[in-house]
Interface confidence: medium
């Protein structure tokens, strides 16, 4: 019979012969022959292959480098790579999450609406009327102005989105 020019799915052509590919999680040791099947071996502990393949070497699992702010989100298997994410307070610079950047701070006049996660940055919001933030922070929310009335005091200086109100004593009417 004529030697094949194309092979079925999960096969590859070598020496005019169709050999089975190695399944995910295994690497090629030797091609098949007229008399023997393809020989495959499982990947080592820190290695993986995620497709049907004829690779002679498995890929190394990604290293989540703590010095780049990375930690393991999902441990790799023989068929999947390790997935990294960022430590608290940082977020990924790309979808591949190869390094992390510090979450931004919210400037005075803005408060933290949502603390950042491993994949998303800090969300800031302007402090509405009645609230203020006088610092640059990645954690501080807008805080309500002090209520002078509850302290039996009066407002001496109005608050802004960046400053609290200033309370003072009530003017006593003299008899």
């Amino acid at each position: 019979p004529e030697p094949p020019t194309a092979c079925r799915e999960k096969q590859y052509l070598i020496n005019s012969q169709c050999c089975s590919l190695c399944q995910p999680g295994q690497k090629l040791v030797s091609d098949c022959t007229e008399f023997t099947e393809t020989e495959c071996l499982p990947c080592g502990e820190s290695e993986f292959l995620d497709t049907w393949n004829r690779e002679t070497h498995c890929h190394q699992h990604k290293y989540c480098d703590p010095n780049l702010g990375l930690r393991v989100q999902q441990k790799g298997t023989s068929e999947t790579d390790t997935i990294c994410t960022c430590e608290e307070g940082w977020h990924c610079t790309s979808e591949a999450c190869e390094s992390c950047v510090l979450h931004r701070s919210c400037s005075p006049g803005f408060g933290v609406k949502q603390i950042a996660t491993g994949v998303s940055d800090t969300i800031c919001e302007p402090c509405p009327v009645g609230f203020f933030s006088n610092v640059s922070s990645a954690f501080e929310k807008c805080h309500p102005w002090t209520s002078c009335e509850t302290k039996d005091l009066v407002v001496q200086q109005a608050g802004t989105n960046k400053t609290d109100v200033v309370c003072g004593p009530q003017d006593r009417l003299r008899a």
Epitope: N67, C100, L102, V135, S137, E140, H143
Partner: nanobody
């Protein structure tokens, strides 16, 4: 000159408690986010907890949530970390730091650290 001086570390049994302190000087303490980070033997730096300038807003790593409490006394320029229900995996050198502006290792200012050993 900026200085951060941690204290309060020591040897404690699993389940025990410790309170770490960090005395700060040389910068506007009450205007900065502050953090505690730790480094276990042979491991990288791990973010433990952070606190906003007013002290009203706090943030914890999942590994310490419900067990550790961060606080600050701006009148004393001091940062605290109350550690309860300590576990062997909490063994590390603990550092206080200004919240950094770059990658994890590039803290703008941080102290010499205090060693916490959890062992029976």
């Amino acid at each position: 000159e900026v200085q951060l001086l941690e204290s309060g570390g020591g040897l404690v049994q699993p389940g025990g408690s410790l309170r770490l302190s960090c005395a700060a000087s040389g910068f506007t303490f009450d205007g900065r986010d502050m953090v505690w980070v730790r480094q276990a033997p042979g491991k990288g730096l791990e973010w433990v907890s952070a606190i906003s300038p007013s002290g009203l807003d706090t943030y914890y790593a999942d590994s310490v949530k419900g067990r550790f409490t961060i606080s600050r006394d701006n009148s004393k320029n001091t940062l605290y970390l109350q550690m309860n229900s300590l576990r062997a995996e909490d063994t590390a050198v603990y550092y206080c730091a200004e919240r950094p502006q770059m990658l994890v290792t590039n803290f703008d200012y941080w102290g010499q650290g205090t060693l916490v050993t959890v062992s029976s």
